[in-house]
Interface confidence: medium
């Protein structure tokens, strides 16, 4: 069976002018997934991203996340790229108010 992931992109402020963008994939099966941030259409190098483990979410499916830190104002240059079971998609950083929350970094 294949269950496609639900992908959600959120932003949180870490310091003035800097934000962490987090891309979360959830409720997918099987567990193999590619999740990475792209800047200007190109995957970021590994040293500028942080990944969460792929974990069971209790429903027989899995969840994971990837985050990167960017400067406020350059959100439109970034997209989250997802590939799962032959399907792929890109998800933009939402425009609008940034959550003033502590990030996972």
């Amino acid at each position: 069976r294949t269950v496609p992931p639900m992908v959600n992109v959120t932003c949180s402020e870490v310091s003035e002018g800097n934000i962490t963008v987090t891309c979360r994939a959830s409720s997918f099966y099987p567990r193999n997934i590619t999740l990475t941030w792209r800047q200007d259409g190109v995957s970021l190098s590994h040293n500028t991203q942080q990944w969460g483990d792929v974990l069971p979410d209790g429903n027989g499916t899995y969840q994971t996340w990837v985050a990167t830190r960017i400067r406020q104002g350059e959100e439109q240059r970034f997209t989250c790229y997802m590939e799962h079971s032959g399907n792929h998609g890109t998800h933009p950083v939402p425009s609008g108010k940034v959550l003033a929350l502590q990030s996972q970094w």
Epitope: V14, N18, R38, D40, G41, S43, R69
Partner: antibody
Framework: QVQLVESGGGLVKPGGSLRLSCAAS????????MSWIRQAPGKGLEWVSY????????YYADSVKGRFTISRDNAKNSLYLQMNSLRAEDTAVYYC??????????????WGQGTLVTVSS | DIVMTQSPLSLPVTPGEPASISCRSS???????????LYWFLQKPGQSPQILIY???NLASGVPDRFSGSGSGTAFTLKISRVEAEDVGVYYC?????????FGPGTKLEIK
């Protein structure tokens, strides 16, 4: 070995058009972003335009915006620069370069030999 | 746009002696991902430019280790520990932080 070969330069009158090509070999062209850089005779370097691997992200210098169009054909391993409404100040050697900064590598690590565009009446 | 400046614009050096080129940016090139997007290029006479240093202090592949890059967010230095005849040419710094990418005016290194 990586090779970038530009062509299409030449003499053109102000207001005219030219299409530059850059033939790439020795690497997986479709994986890499590309840029055009130019250099006026006896002057410094000026970045002109950028295109992402899939062609979905494109940027231009203000000096060429609305007149130049960057494009690529990944099946032909080729990069293009369509230059319209050319001006005397566009006279320069045009270089194509790879842009690999997101691959744990760096930008502009390979350059072509350049092609000369001369805009004069 | 980020403005890049360099000094000196001309640098006569005796072979075997050290050389230093300064570059400044009108805005910090330190990204929040902790990379500093400053590059150094050398254009030898009659040739295309070649990369020397990427992300401020990293030596590009095949570049002799007599070259080194250092700096902070807005002030950068390219050093050559012992200049050789083959080092002649024009050295450019470039910011790769945001569009449009911008170059410094160049520093011409020549042998005394």
């Amino acid at each position: 070995q990586v090779q970038l070969v530009e062509s299409g330069g030449g003499l053109v009158k102000p207001g005219g058009s030219l299409r530059l090509s850059c033939a790439a070999s020795g690497f997986t062209f479709s994986n890499y972003a590309m840029s055009w850089i130019r250099q006026a005779p006896g002057k410094g370097l000026e970045w002109v335009s950028y295109i992402s691997p899939g062609g979905d992200y494109i940027y231009y210098a203000d000096s060429v915006k609305g007149r130049f169009t960057i494009s690529r054909d990944n099946a032909k391993n080729s990069l293009y620069l369509q230059m319209n409404s050319l001006r005397a100040e566009d006279t320069a050697v045009y270089y194509c370069t790879t842009d690999r900064r997101h691959y744990g590598s760096y930008a502009m690590d390979y350059w072509g030999q350049g092609t000369l565009v001369t805009v004069s009446s | 746009d980020i403005v890049m400046t360099q000094s000196p614009l001309s640098l006569p050096v005796t072979p075997g002696e050290p050389a230093s080129i300064s570059c400044r940016s009108s805005k910090s090139l330190l990204h929040s991902n902790l990379n500093t997007y400053l590059y150094w290029f050398l254009q030898k006479p009659g040739q295309s430019p070649q990369i020397l240093i990427y992300r401020m202090s990293n030596l590009a592949s095949g570049v002799p280790d007599r070259f080194s890059g250092s700096g902070s967010g807005t002030a950068f230095t390219l050093k050559i520990s012992r200049v050789e005849a083959e080092d002649v040419g024009v050295y450019y710094c470039m910011q790769h932080l945001e569009y449009p990418f911008t170059f410094g005016p160049g520093t011409k290194l020549e042998i005394k």
